[in-house]
């Protein structure tokens, strides 16, 4: 009982004057509160309360459920308590089976006793299974058993409160512990595609996958630099305990150009936040953009190979591709493939493989591509470099020596005179006339050059060399002269290839 200090309000006194009282089931509970300023009795068990305004609390036939704390309070707010145990061999525990634990926190198994004189008040696993080795608990007969520092591994642990009564173990009803995990990492977020390209009116749909330990994770789709609420749909799954997955799908049923922008999937928990973005580009119509991977003017040596390569962006997907030369379509020698296997790829590569090109195969090679919205083309001008070929070398009636050579690039013709029998022709002779002739072949073909010198300048026997050359090579033709009296005679002309 409380001690009284004169002049100060004192707490009420309770009869019987003990802190704990044990009664048998069926017996009477009679508690008297003495205080001039009596206000109420309060009864509390399993954290539920009942009140009584009578100063004497009487329960004629006590039941196990009358076990609990009885508190008398006066008008000064001072109180005094007695704890009553109603001993019932058939009901040793009062229980509230709701049992939730937060990871790393303590949680109370609410199984207060109706008899404080039983022994070995503890927890036991269901069906004889042992409790986890690291599970620690503190029993309190008036409240229950406190599990210390709940672990994630205890989730859905089945247990009983247990006591020994007269040498026998008695178990309470089952409790199933539901553990709420602590967030110890940020959510994991991913998006179905990093970028989307659509035409106006098409549906935009993107899915964000959020993974975390529980469904308490928060997630939302946001449009960057906008407060507009976005319409989302959700699917979620628990892949076993503490492995939660949510799919948040954002849909714009008919996308417009001004819907273009960056969309962010944001998720957070008490540990932190994570986000991932996707970019939407909406175009009013499809497009094709072609990028040559080599110069569109191509020079290649006779007999060599060349690859004409383009990359192109096409949206929607390309439907027809072809390579054309001289109004003829190539059926083979070319390949077309996507630049990447990525689902959102819009970039493609096309390669035309030209092998052992002849001088006659120069010209315009055109790549054409189309999709459902547009057509596009690119042309390559291919020049085949050929060493000069001397087409004609003649002594004309007017006494001129004429040499006609063809090649690409345009050949240069030089003339040389070798007196007598000398093999080396070093003395150069200036031409009288040089002309570039129009080729009768296709454009991009060989260029024809005609050069003439006046043979009357030669007064001695010897050889005249016509030498045609360009970047690729050179070719010579020779005129042999012999004087018989006053007459100059052309002996058989011949050509000599000089590499």
């Amino acid at each position: 009982q409380p001690s009284v200090s004169p002049g100060e309000p004192s707490p009420p006194s309770i009869h019987p004057g003990k802190s704990d009282l044990i009664v048998r089931v069926g017996d009477e509970i009679r508690l008297l509160c003495t205080d001039p300023g009596f206000v109420k009795w309060t009864f509390e068990i399993l954290d539920e309360t009942n009140e009584n305004k009578q100063n004497e609390w009487i329960t004629e036939k006590a039941e196990a459920t009358n076990t609990g704390k009885y508190t008398c309070t006066n008008k000064h707010g001072l109180s005094n308590s007695i704890y009553v145990f109603v001993r019932d061999p058939a009901k040793l525990f009062l229980v509230d089976r709701s049992l939730y634990g937060k990871e790393d926190n303590d949680t109370l198994v609410r199984c207060p006793l109706t008899d404080p004189e039983v022994t070995n008040y503890s927890l036991k696993g269901c069906q004889g299974k042992p409790l986890p080795k690291d599970l620690r608990f503190i029993p309190d007969p008036k409240a229950g058993i406190m599990i210390k520092s709940v672990k994630r591994a205890y989730h859905r642990l089945c247990l009983h409160c247990s006591v020994d009564q007269e040498g026998k173990s008695v178990l309470s009803e089952k409790f199933i512990l539901k553990v709420r995990p602590a967030f110890k990492a940020v959510p994991v977020v991913s998006v179905s595609k990093a970028s989307y390209l659509l035409r106006e009116g098409e549906e935009f749909t993107v899915t964000c996958t959020i993974k975390d330990v529980s469904s308490s994770v928060y997630s939302t789709w946001k449009r960057e630099n906008s407060q507009t609420k976005l319409q989302e749909k959700y699917n979620s799954w628990h892949h076993g305990d503490f492995n939660y997955e949510r799919q948040a799908t954002l849909t714009i049923s008919s996308a417009r150009v001004n819907d273009s922008g960056v969309f962010m999937c944001y998720a957070n928990n008490t540990f932190g936040s994570a986000n991932v973005t996707t970019t939407l580009e909406v175009v009013d119509k499809g497009f094709i953009n072609i990028f040559p991977m080599i110069n569109t003017t191509v020079f290649v040596n006779d007999g060599e190979n060349v690859d004409l390569i383009v990359e192109y962006e096409a949206f929607p997907k390309p439907e027809h591709q072809q390579w054309i030369y001289m109004n003829r379509t190539f059926t083979d020698k070319w390949e077309d493939y996507p630049k990447s296997e990525n689902e959102s790829n819009i970039r493609y590569v096309s390669e035309l493989h030209l092998t052992r090109l002849k001088g006659t195969e120069g010209g315009t090679y055109t790549f054409l591509v189309s999709n459902s919205d547009v057509n596009a083309a690119i042309a390559f001008n291919v020049y085949v470099n050929t060493k000069p070929e001397i087409l004609t070398y003649d002594r004309l009636v007017n006494g001129m020596l004429q040499c006609v050579a063809a090649g690409f690039p345009e050949p240069t013709i030089d003339w040389y005179f070798c007196p007598g029998t000398e093999q080396r022709c070093s003395a150069s002779v200036l031409p009288v006339d040089v002309q570039t002739l129009n080729s009768s072949g296709p454009p991009f073909g060989k260029l024809v050059v005609q050069s003439s010198i006046d043979s009357s300048a030669f007064k001695h026997n010897g050889t005249v060399e016509c030498k045609a050359y360009n970047d690729v090579g050179k070719t010579s033709a020779y005129f042999n002269f012999a004087f018989k009296g006053n007459n100059k005679e052309q002996i058989h002309p011949h050509t000599l290839f000089t590499p």
Partner: antibody, heavy 117, light 111 residues
Framework: QVQLVQSGAEVKKPGASVKVSCKAS????????MHWVRQAPGQGLEWMGV????????SYNQKFKGRVTMTTDTSTSTAYMELRSLTSDDTAVYYC??????????WGQGTLVTVSA | EIVLTQSPSSLSASVGDRVTITCRAS??????????MHWYQQKPGKAPKLLIY???NLESGVPSRFSGSGSGTDFTLTISSLQPEDFATYYC?????????FGQGTKLEIK
């Protein structure tokens, strides 16, 4: 004698927020989980979420994600449920319910929230 | 989420009739022998009232004509002899897994 007494009816405009209160008595407020359930006119019951005893942790039905916040004021033994960005679909009676021994043993009388332009 | 499907959706019966309402869950709501399935009664303009908890336990103060049975995914609420005050809507509810869910309800009407 456990009692849950809820705040009165509310009329709100679309886009606004509402905060419903639930004052508890007859038990130790911090020892029991408080759930919120709503019922649209002529429709069934829909669980919105729970605020757990002690820690004040919450778990929400994902349908209401980002729009709902559940809180408590332990000094007055009152639970609150705030719902934001209201639309006409949120017109409903909102109930608080105390979880006891695995079930919803005690319910508030309900709060009608009408969302109308 | 666990989907609960009640049948029938509505039912006409007379005072004194025996009535059975079923609730089927899309997945089991059992754990360690407990079925986390409960039954509630709701009258117009009133809050739901708990009748049966953990599938078969009668809530204190509820008349004994109400009973519940079942486990796993199939559950039944039975009213052995209908009384006039029993005409109401009945809901099953699971709290084995979040989000907790309710059946769509069974409206019991006077024939």
């Amino acid at each position: 004698q456990v009692q849950l007494v809820q705040s009165g009816a509310e009329v709100k405009k679309p886009g606004a927020s509402v905060k419903v209160s639930c004052k508890a008595s007859g038990y130790t407020f911090t020892s029991y989980n408080m759930h919120w359930v709503r019922q649209a006119p002529g429709q069934g019951l829909e669980w919105m979420g729970v605020i757990y005893s002690g820690s004040g942790d919450t778990s929400y039905n994902q349908k209401f994600k980002g729009r709902v916040t559940m809180t408590t004021d332990t000094s007055t033994s009152t639970a609150y449920m705030e719902l934001r960005s209201l639309t006409s679909d949120d017109t409903a009676v909102y109930y608080c319910a105390r979880e006891r021994d695995t079930r919803f043993g005690n319910w508030g009388q309900g709060t009608l929230v009408t969302v109308s332009a | 989420e666990i989907v609960l499907t009640q049948s029938p959706s509505s039912l006409s019966a007379s005072v004194g009739d025996r009535v059975t309402i079923t609730c089927r869950a899309s997945e089991s709501v059992d754990i360690y022998g407990y079925s986390f399935m409960h039954w509630y009664q709701q009258k117009p303009g009133k809050a739901p009232k708990l009748l049966i908890y953990l599938a078969s336990n009668l809530e204190s103060g509820v008349p004994s004509r109400f009973s519940g049975s079942g486990s796993g995914t199939d559950f039944t609420l039975t009213i052995s002899s209908l009384q006039p005050e029993d005409f109401a809507t009945y809901y099953c509810q699971q709290n084995n897994e979040e989000p907790y869910t309710f059946g769509q309800g069974t409206k019991l009407e006077i024939k």
